[in-house]
Interface confidence: low
């Protein structure tokens, strides 16, 4: 006999990186017929929603109107159908950004390199932090974590055209409180010996959405959002 229901998906809209004082919605998608959803924050019950009518709704939303450092942390959700509860969702790491200061990102030996050349990004922030995050616009799997008291090095190694794209970095005051984003640095890689045609960049989110971190595709499925966020958060952990 089935003891639990499948776990729901959890994600944040517009994104799990939320500028302080901005709004965010935590979404939990379970099954039609679920009579109750519970949102847990840092292991404790945070909010409850009971959709009406349950047979026509498979998703609930928990709205946070004013993001701050106290609201940043790990969220999960569960739902029940009748008396049967689901497995808990994956953890959603909700991050507050635009805290305190702005790092500077540079790339060495430069933003225009030949394929095969070794490239290193440097993210610098003079205020007290020890963890840095390098993000490439596009797939969230391009998240790297680095450490240093004022600067972190992010060696990409010998690059290929797959490394082309726009990068930003953040300083992290803790796992869930990040700095303002750096200005963008666009890496151009030319002369790929293995593939002389200009390979397309990874599927990317709209470049102009970085300012507000609306890194979600307009046509993307909700589950895609959830998986996207979860991939990035696993890398952060």
């Amino acid at each position: 006999q089935q003891q639990t229901l499948p776990k729901p998906f959890i994600w944040a809209e517009p994104h799990f990186m939320v500028p302080k004082e901005k709004q965010v919605t935590i979404c939990c998608q379970g099954n039609y017929g679920a009579v109750e959803y519970q949102l847990h924050f840092e292991g404790s019950l945070f909010a409850v929603d009971r959709p009406k009518p349950p047979e026509r709704i498979n998703k609930v939303q928990f709205y946070i109107p004013d993001m701050n450092s106290r609201m940043a942390g790990q969220y999960s959700c569960i739902y029940r159908v009748g008396e049967l509860w689901s497995e808990p969702s994956n953890l959603l790491d909700l991050v507050v950004t635009e805290m305190y200061d702005t790092p500077t990102l540079s790339v060495h030996p430069g933003p225009e390199v030949i394929s095969g050349e070794k490239v290193t990004f440097y993210c610098r922030l003079d205020t007290a932090t020890s963890m840095f995050l390098l993000l490439k616009e596009g797939r969230s799997s391009h998240v790297q974590r680095g450490y240093g008291k004022v600067q972190a090095e992010f060696p990409l190694g010998p690059v290929t055209t797959a490394h082309r794209g726009t990068y930003r970095c953040f300083g992290s005051y803790n796992n869930h409180a990040w700095s303002f984003p750096s200005e963008p640095v666009k890496l151009l890689v030319t002369g790929d010996i293995e593939n002389t045609s200009l390979a397309p960049e990874d599927p990317t989110f709209p470049a102009d959405t970085w300012g507000t971190y609306l890194l979600t595709t307009e046509t993307g499925l909700q589950k895609d959002h959830a998986l996207w966020d979860h991939t990035a958060q696993n890398l952060l952990r």
Epitope: T102, T104, S106, V107, H108, P109, G110, P111, T120, Y122, R124, G148, K149, V150, Q151, E153, P155, E183, P184, V185
Partner: antibody, heavy 115, light 107 residues
């Protein structure tokens, strides 16, 4: 407070070598990138070399293959080994601290290459 | 390498004047620009980094602006101690490169 004290400059004949030192204090030396910048008499600033906290090094084309930057983190000291010197290398040499922008500078040391 | 071009190469101004120095990069450098002040016989002093961020201890009459290729250093009200040579430097890529300098002289 942060201090960078330079030594090792002087008069040297063309083709000879010289080693400059920069003793650092007042900060955690091995956390920072360190640069050498030079200034020929009456001229502007010219970047020479950098060594990052991770150990990677870069050089200006004008000194590549002749100059070597190094650091001894146990002694909080930065070095510039200059070989095959020519008259064009005559300048005041500054060490400086910083990753990209140069926050603190040494007092400078004059290197004169002349026969 | 990225070339940095400053203008003017020199200027004469009086105490209290508003002074503007420009710096142009040969390619886009985002906001990766620093400004330094140098007085004769002394080491340069950092004034501005990341185009507009004032270094600690630098008077607020100094300000920086710009992004991409065009940048400006402004001294809102020139003081006697501000007569010096000013350099811009891009910190976008290696090698970092300096402008040729702008000498601010007393009129």
């Amino acid at each position: 407070q942060v201090q960078l004290v330079q030594s090792g400059g002087g008069l040297v004949q063309p083709g000879r070598s010289l080693r400059l030192s920069c003793a650092a204090s007042g900060f955690t030396f091995d956390d920072y990138a360190m640069h050498w910048v030079r200034q020929a008499p009456g001229e502007g600033l010219e970047w020479v070399s950098v060594i990052y906290s991770g150990g990677s090094t870069y050089y200006a084309d004008s000194v590549k293959g002749r100059f070597t930057i190094s650091r001894d983190n146990s002694k909080n000291t930065l070095y510039l080994q200059m070989n095959s010197l020519s008259a064009e290398d005559t300048a005041v040499y500054y060490c400086a601290r910083g990753a990209q922008w140069l926050v603190n500078w040494g007092q400078g040391t004059l290197v004169t290459v002349s026969s | 390498d990225i070339q940095m071009t400053q203008s003017p190469s020199s200027l004469s101004a009086s105490v209290g004047d508003r002074v503007t120095i420009t710096c142009r990069a040969s390619q886009g450098i985002s906001n990766a620009l620093a400004w330094y002040q140098q007085k004769p016989g002394k080491a340069p002093k950092l004034l501005i980094y990341a185009a507009s961020r004032l270094e600690s201890g630098v008077p607020s009459r100094f300000s920086g602006s710009g992004s991409g290729t065009d940048f400006t250093l402004t001294i809102s009200s020139l003081q006697p101690e501000d007569f010096a040579t000013y350099y811009c430097q891009q910190h976008y890529s290696t090698p970092p490169t300096f402008g040729q300098g702008t000498k601010v002289e007393i009129k």
